[in-house]
Interface confidence: medium
């Protein structure tokens, strides 16, 4: 009966691929007599004329290649390997990721304004959604030589924290310990990606015990 020659490399059942890229499904097999391979998409016979751009079937490599994948290529792809003594099959799932990037989105209502007692600890919370890797910053408005804005009208700010987020959804926190009156004022949670910027201003008021 047919058998897989690289079963340890066939455990990746889901391929999530950005649109426009190339996908190859492979089911390396052997048997005596040499088995044949055929392909199904969502349980039905799959042939080149079933997709724009066609497909490449490489029987010697036990593979199916699709170039420039599009969302309609999503589905379950099954290789069926058989000879007169039996058949084996493997199913891969293809997800095609569409690229419709947008500027970051900040969850409404966060961060919230807070009032704190002198010497206490305060934590602000900002939730960022971005399909493109965002640069996230916590900023505080400051005065320079008694002025809140520069000559070009841009507010003076100091960067408290800055990093690139690896995730699509970032739950970020700014912790201020042992606050003093100096910590009072206007702050910003800002997220930037290559599409644009999103920011939310919030206030911290500090008062005596």
């Amino acid at each position: 009966a047919p058998y897989w020659t690289r079963p340890e490399r066939m455990d990746k059942k889901l391929l999530a691929v950005p649109a426009a890229n190339t996908v190859r499904f492979a089911c390396p097999a052997a048997g005596n007599p040499t088995p044949s391979i055929s392909w199904l998409k969502n349980g039905r016979e799959f042939r080149g004329e079933h997709r724009i751009g066609g497909i490449k079937l490489r029987h010697q490599q036990w593979s199916l290649v699709m170039e420039s994948v599009v969302p309609s290529d999503r589905g379950n792809y099954t290789c069926v390997v058989e000879n007169k003594f039996g058949s084996i099959r493997q199913t891969y799932t293809l997800d095609v990721l569409e690229r419709s990037p947008h500027r970051p989105i900040l969850q409404a209502g966060l961060p919230a304004n807070q009032t704190a007692v002198l010497g206490s600890d305060v934590e602000f919370h900002c939730k960022v959604y971005s399909d493109a890797q965002p640069h996230i910053q916590w900023l505080k408005h400051v005065e320079v030589n008694g002025s809140k804005v520069g000559p070009d009208g841009t507010p003076y700010v100091t960067v408290l924290k800055s990093w690139i987020s690896e995730s699509v959804e970032a739950d970020v926190r700014l912790r201020l310990a042992n606050v003093s009156e100096r910590d009072g004022g206007e702050y910003l949670c800002r997220a930037t990606n290559f599409i644009g910027v999103a920011e939310k201003a919030f206030w911290l008021s500090v008062h005596g015990p």
């Epitope: 690289r6 490399r9 066939m10 990746k12 391929l15 691929v17 950005p18 649109a19 426009a20 890229n21 190339t22 996908v23 190859r24 499904f25 492979a26 390396p28 490489r58 490599q61 593979s63 290649v65 891969y92 690229r99 990037p101 493109a132 890797q133 990606n193 290559f194």
Partner: antibody, heavy 126, light 109 residues
């Protein structure tokens, strides 16, 4: 027709910087990354770095880290490569190339370069 | 970081077969791409994922990749095949592109 068209030849003095542009046409710019590869006279291909046109991520070869910056302008479908602190050994032809992702169920993901610019000659000489 | 080794030169008579090799530790576990570069021109992708020919590349070209050696084969070599041939892998550990040193094909006669 899918094309990458690069800016013209440059002659620079040692210590200067050079910025080479690469304008893409004939395809959706943000669907493919851009790699930069250089070739010194009589030498082989040397990869410098790449940029994701989708999210601006960059990755540079160790040799060029800190001296090269690769950027993109999605509004004009143009990629840029800036090389600073030039020395005579930087004399080369600089190529941009479209990066295509190949996803393989057995071997995982791999990237290759399926379309290349015509090359920009940069000469560094005092 | 992957290191790819290619012989610097290869000479073949017209009509014969040219075999380019690209050596690397367990390269068979990676996917290899091949580029052809004619004098004064930009490189052109001629083979991807070890065995796949881009459109416009003749069937005379084929590829394989096993163990520690990837191979690009051109049958019925013609004068127009004279060029430098480079192998390339993607080092997924470092997200870096790695090229072999290239092989110069000379077509005799």
């Amino acid at each position: 027709e899918v094309q990458l068209v690069q800016s013209g030849a440059e002659v620079k003095k040692p210590g200067a910087s050079v910025k080479v542009s690469c304008k893409a046409s004939g395809y959706m710019f943000t669907s493919y990354g851009i790699s930069w590869v250089r070739q010194a006279p009589g030498q082989g291909l040397e990869w410098m770095g790449w940029v994701s046109t989708y999210n601006g991520d960059t990755n540079y070869a160790q040799k060029f880290q800190g001296r090269v910056t690769v950027t993109t302008d999605t509004s004009t479908s143009t990629a840029y490569m800036e090389l600073r602190s030039l020395r005579s050994e930087d004399t080369a032809v600089y190529y941009c190339a479209r990066v295509l992702g190949y996803y393989d169920s057995i071997d995982g993901y791999y990237y290759g370069m399926d379309v290349w610019g015509q090359g920009t000659t940069v000469t560094v000489s005092s | 970081q992957s290191v790819l080794t290619q012989p610097p030169s290869l000479s073949v008579a017209p009509g014969k077969t040219a075999t380019f090799t690209c050596g690397g530790n367990n390269i068979g576990d990676k996917s290899v791409h091949w580029y052809r570069q004619k004098p004064g021109q930009a490189p052109v992708l001629v083979m991807y994922l070890d065995t796949e020919r881009p459109s416009g590349i003749p069937e005379r070209m084929s590829g394989s990749n096993f163990g520690n050696t990837a191979t690009l084969t051109i049958t019925r070599v013609e004068a127009e095949d004279e060029a430098d041939y480079y192998c390339q892998v993607w080092d997924s550990g470092s997200d870096h592109v790695v090229f072999g040193g290239g092989t110069k094909l000379t077509v005799l006669g």
